[in-house]
């Protein structure tokens, strides 16, 4: 029951995380104009991974896509790549995890296969979450660097007579959405990996008390935790998917099917 709950919860959390990663990737507010030094501006600028927007006090908003590919900063391209990889891995992970859910029966799929699929999806979620966190963090670092560079060069002009206020950008809502979503996907992935350990059929004999009752045996591990049942009636496990993207590879020691807690 606990394994099913862990698997289901992991799926739901990952689903929410991946949805968040997709949302963050599509959002225009990755960076927003810093109004601290120019609170009286009637024009508000904000930028996303795919386009930049200007909102006027008049209520009109104009967005322009980045129609060039080669002319964009390498860092922006890298962030785009990380987020897309995160989304793709997360989506594949979700697909795999749906079939791995204990509550879903597909033909005569064995528990070992479900365990492997759960582990695979868990790893995918972890990598997906790391990709998202890395992507958002790279963008945030880029913003911080640019912010201080523009602060050092805040006002330019001829002889100090004419001032040109340089537009500075600070963290937009998408960054926070991305960090949270990446974290959720990561957590969901870890939960899936943990659930995998409980799903795998036991192959090693442990010192355990065996109770024989009416032709079907139930082995209990010390501590009263039900490790396996005869022909495995799968308890229902439901998971909702949470969108999440992972960033970068993570060294992960995966539980083997012999690793029982």
């Amino acid at each position: 029951m606990a394994v099913t709950a862990c698997q289901g919860l992991g799926f739901v959390v990952s689903l929410i995380g991946i949805a968040g990663i997709i949302a963050a990737t599509c959002m225009d507010q990755w960076s927003t104009q810093d109004l601290y030094n120019n609170p009286v501006t009637a024009v508000f600028n904000y930028q996303g991974l795919w386009r930049s927007c200007v909102r006027e006090s008049s209520g009109f908003t104009e967005c322009r896509g980045y129609f060039t590919l080669l002319g964009l900063p390498a860092m922006l391209q890298a962030v785009r790549a990380l987020m897309i990889v995160g989304i793709v891995l997360g989506a594949i992970g979700l697909l795999v995890s749906i079939f791995a859910l204990k509550c879903i029966r597909i033909g005569s799929m064995e528990d070992s296969a479900k365990a492997n699929m759960t582990l695979t999806s868990g790893i995918m979620f972890i990598v997906s979450g790391l990709c998202a966190i890395a992507g958002v963090s790279v963008f945030a670092n880029m913003l911080v660097t640019n912010f201080w560079m523009s602060t050092a060069n805040m006002y330019t002009g001829m002889g100090g007579m004419v001032q040109t206020v340089q537009t500075r950008y600070t963290f937009g809502a998408a960054l926070f959405v991305g960090w949270v979503a990446g974290g959720l996907t990561l957590i969901g992935g870890v939960m899936m990996c943990i659930a995998c350990r409980g799903l795998a059929p036991e192959e090693t004999n442990y010192k355990a008390v065996s109770y024989h009752a009416s032709g079907h045996s139930v082995a209990y591990k010390p501590g009263g935790f039900k490790a396996s049942t005869g022909f495995g009636s799968n308890t229902k496990n439901k998971k909702i998917y949470d969108g999440g993207a992972r960033t970068e590879d993570e060294v992960q020691s995966y539980p083997s099917k012999h690793d029982y807690v």
């Epitope: 009286v40 009637a42 600028n45 006090s57 004419v162 001032q163």
Partner: antibody, heavy 118, light 113 residues
Framework: QVQLQQSGAELVKPGASVKLSCKAS????????INWVRQRPEQGLEWIGW????????KYNEKFKGKATLTTDKSSSTAYMQISSLTSEDSAVYFC???????????WGQGTLVTVSA | DIVMTQSPSSLAVTAGEKVTMTCKSS????????????LTWYQQRPGQPPKLLLY???TRESGVPDRFTGSGSGTDFALTITSVQAEDLAVYYC?????????FGSGTKLEIK
């Protein structure tokens, strides 16, 4: 077509208040902000502030804070500006105008002449 | 506040002539986000409310004759009327639409000889 119809001329005493109206027609009133502009006799234009009927957000020129109060009535598609503690300095033509691209003002009202005199 | 300085304060031309008036702002009106200058030109004929001519420094409002042309960027702007007509007799104002408070120039009065 878009029209802004302003109330008639006002003759008021110093220290009194006056409420000017600007009735909009020909467009969705809640979609666009309404600006108010003052023009003193033989002088230039001064921006007083704007109000968005949709969400009620208001922005004032610091110079007119406490002097002008902007409100709207969505049911009648009318914007109002109340000017308080009137002095001879407030004698002017007051215009309302709809916000447009580039924060510009389009579709101006015909103006309301306010004369402050004892 | 941004100060808008218009020159000349008045000018008299004969019909058909080309006329240029300038507007200078104390701060740049160029927005880096969309590379547009938040400067507007208005025409105010005697006894009438102002009429929008150009926004974003050079974008002509619909219905405005193409003899009106806006130019400039940053802090220096100009309004050119290529062939002045009798109905162009008016005061022309430039306006800062970039930062609050929105400020107007003192105007350039165009007279027809």
């Amino acid at each position: 077509q878009v029209q802004l119809q302003q109330s008639g001329a006002e003759l008021v005493k110093p220290g009194a208040s006056v409420k000017l109206s600007c009735k909009a027609s020909g467009y969705t009133f809640t979609t666009f902000g309404i600006n108010w502009v003052r023009q003193r006799p033989e002088q230039g234009l001064e921006w007083i502030g704007w109000i968005f009927p949709g969400d009620g957000s208001i922005k004032y020129n610091e110079k007119f804070k406490g002097k002008a109060t902007l409100t709207t009535d969505k049911s009648s598609s009318t914007a109002y500006m109340q000017i308080s503690s009137l002095t001879s300095e407030d004698s002017a033509v007051y215009f309302c105008a709809r916000f447009y691209y580039g924060n510009s003002f389009v579709s101006w009202g015909q103006g309301t002449l306010v004369t402050v005199s004892a | 506040d941004i100060v808008m300085t218009q020159s000349p304060s008045s000018l008299a031309v004969t019909a058909g002539e080309k006329v240029t008036m300038t507007c200078k702002s104390s701060q740049s009106l160029l927005n880096s986000g969309n590379q547009k200058n938040y400067l507007t030109w208005y025409q105010q004929r005697p006894g009438q409310p102002p009429k929008l001519l150009l926004y974003w420094a050079s974008t002509r409002e619909s219905g405005v004759p193409d003899r009106f042309t806006g130019s400039g960027s940053g802090t220096d702007f100009a309004l050119t009327i290529t062939s002045v007509q009798a109905e162009d007799l008016a005061v022309y104002y430039c306006q800062n639409d970039y930062t609050y408070p929105f400020t107007f120039g003192s105007g350039t009065k165009l007279e027809i000889k």
